[in-house]
């Protein structure tokens, strides 16, 4: 006996109560593949989640976070509070980065400034809460008599 359900396309389900007729998915449900015996309820973007893509009969809704929050987890399953650059999120909210650390994003943790001396270089631009240090040439390259710049190209 041929399984008539395999003929039911995405967006429908095989209705056993109606002699395996392909019935459209009810409102607020979807089937993303053919041959399904039920349609799945759509994901609801509620609360801190906002709808990025509406549910259709063939695809689930996709959620995003409201302004001031960013997505975490698979399929944006959580929303984490944004902080300013130069801050990190703690249990008590957004806190400024400690001296010697920086964060150039609205999310994530404060990271230590680069230690230029580990690469034998010197600090060209000091770090801030929002920016890492910029490492320059090694101190030896900056000693008197050493050329610290590329000589100009000869005039034509």
């Amino acid at each position: 006996l041929q399984d008539l359900c395999s003929n039911c396309p995405a967006g429908t389900f095989c209705d056993n109560n109606r002699s395996q007729i392909c019935s459209p998915c009810p409102p607020n449900s979807f089937s993303s593949a053919g041959g399904q015996r039920t349609c799945d309820i759509c994901r609801q973007c509620k609360g801190v989640f906002k709808t990025r893509k509406e549910c259709s009969s063939t695809s689930n809704a996709e959620c995003d976070c409201i302004s001031g929050y960013h997505c975490l987890g698979a399929e944006c399953s959580m929303c984490e509070q944004d902080c300013k650059q130069g801050q990190e999120l703690t249990k008590k909210g957004c806190k400024d980065c400690c001296f010697g650390t920086f964060n150039d994003q609205k999310r994530g943790i404060c990271r230590p400034w680069t230690n230029c001396s580990l690469d034998g270089k010197s600090v060209l631009v000091n770090g801030t809460k929002e920016r890492d240090v910029v490492c320059g040439p090694s101190p030896a390259d900056l000693s008197p008599g050493a050329s610290s710049a590329t000589p100009p190209a000869p005039a034509r």
Epitope: T38, D40, I41, C42, R43, Q44, K46, G47, V48, F49, I66, S67, G68, Y69, L72, G73, A74, E75, S77, M78, C79, E80, Q81, L89, T90, K91, G93
Partner: antibody
Framework: EVQLVESGGGLVQPGGSLRLSCAAS??????????VGWIRQAPGKGLEWLAL???????YYSPSLKSRLTISRDNSKNTLYLQLNSLRAEDTAVYYC???????????????WGQGTLVTVSS | DIQLTQSPSSLSASVGDRVTITCRAS??????LAWYQQKPGKAPKLLIY???SLESGVPSRFSGSGSGTDFTLTISSLQPEDFATYYC????????FGQGTKVEIK
């Protein structure tokens, strides 16, 4: 520190109505991202979600109880309310107020709960 | 509505035992699943959210796993204070709870 304190429970006649309150402290009901709801538990039974209201006044109700429930809030008092009409014996339960999400990560779970208020529907 | 079915409904275990509770959803709710612990006369306490994230302050002997329709709460070494009722909860579409699993002393 986040705190939720429910009140308004007691003995109610069948067919009557009740209005429960939940006083929130340690956070504002109108803070962006915050949702607070009601969950009940009949004696010796499991948990049943009833309703939730968002910071921006979006309301969500349990489909099976939607016609009898009204959730609301008063931002000036930082207080949440639940009105339940046409009460029946099976509405006898402890009613909990709960806040969605955790401290800095928000999602569809409840990290903060009140101590609950007992509602008894009986003649 | 999305239904959540917990198994077993109750179990008896001893201190030090490894305990596993399962929660099956009527359709995929991944990863919008949380676990709670409730003791008599007390409000539920959040243990796990997002299927596997441990709530702050919850002992590391509690862990959550699973995806799609099948989820598990594991207590690696049962302690005296862990005897309680445990509930799963989905937040994928509205909110629903499982019927609960009572963990009793053997």
């Amino acid at each position: 520190e986040v705190q939720l304190v429910e009140s308004g429970g007691g003995l109610v006649q069948p067919g009557g109505s009740l209005r429960l309150s939940c006083a929130a402290s340690g956070f504002s009901l109108s803070t962006s991202g915050v949702g607070v709801g009601w969950i009940r538990q009949a004696p010796g039974k499991g948990l049943e979600w009833l309703a939730l209201i968002d910071w921006d006044d979006d309301k969500y109700y349990s489909p099976s109880l939607k016609s009898r429930l009204t959730i609301s809030r008063d931002n000036s008092k930082n207080t949440l309310y639940l009105q339940l009409n046409s009460l029946r014996a099976e509405d006898t339960a402890v009613y909990y107020c709960a806040r969605g999400g955790s401290d800095t990560v928000l999602g569809d779970w409840f990290a903060y709960w009140g101590q609950g208020t007992l509602v008894t529907v009986s003649s | 509505d999305i239904q959540l079915t917990q198994s077993p409904s109750s179990l008896s275990a001893s201190v030090g035992d490894r305990v596993t509770i399962t929660c099956r959803a009527s359709q995929s709710v991944s990863p919008y699943l949380a676990w709670y612990q409730q003791k008599p006369g007390k409000a539920p306490k959040l243990l796990i959210y997002d299927a596997s994230s441990l709530e702050s302050g919850v002992p590391s002997r509690f862990s959550g796993s699973g995806s799609g329709t099948d989820f598990t709460l594991t207590i690696s070494s049962l302690q005296p204070e862990d005897f309680a009722t445990y509930y799963c909860q989905q937040g994928y579409s509205l909110w629903t709870f499982g019927q609960g699993t009572k963990v009793e002393i053997k």
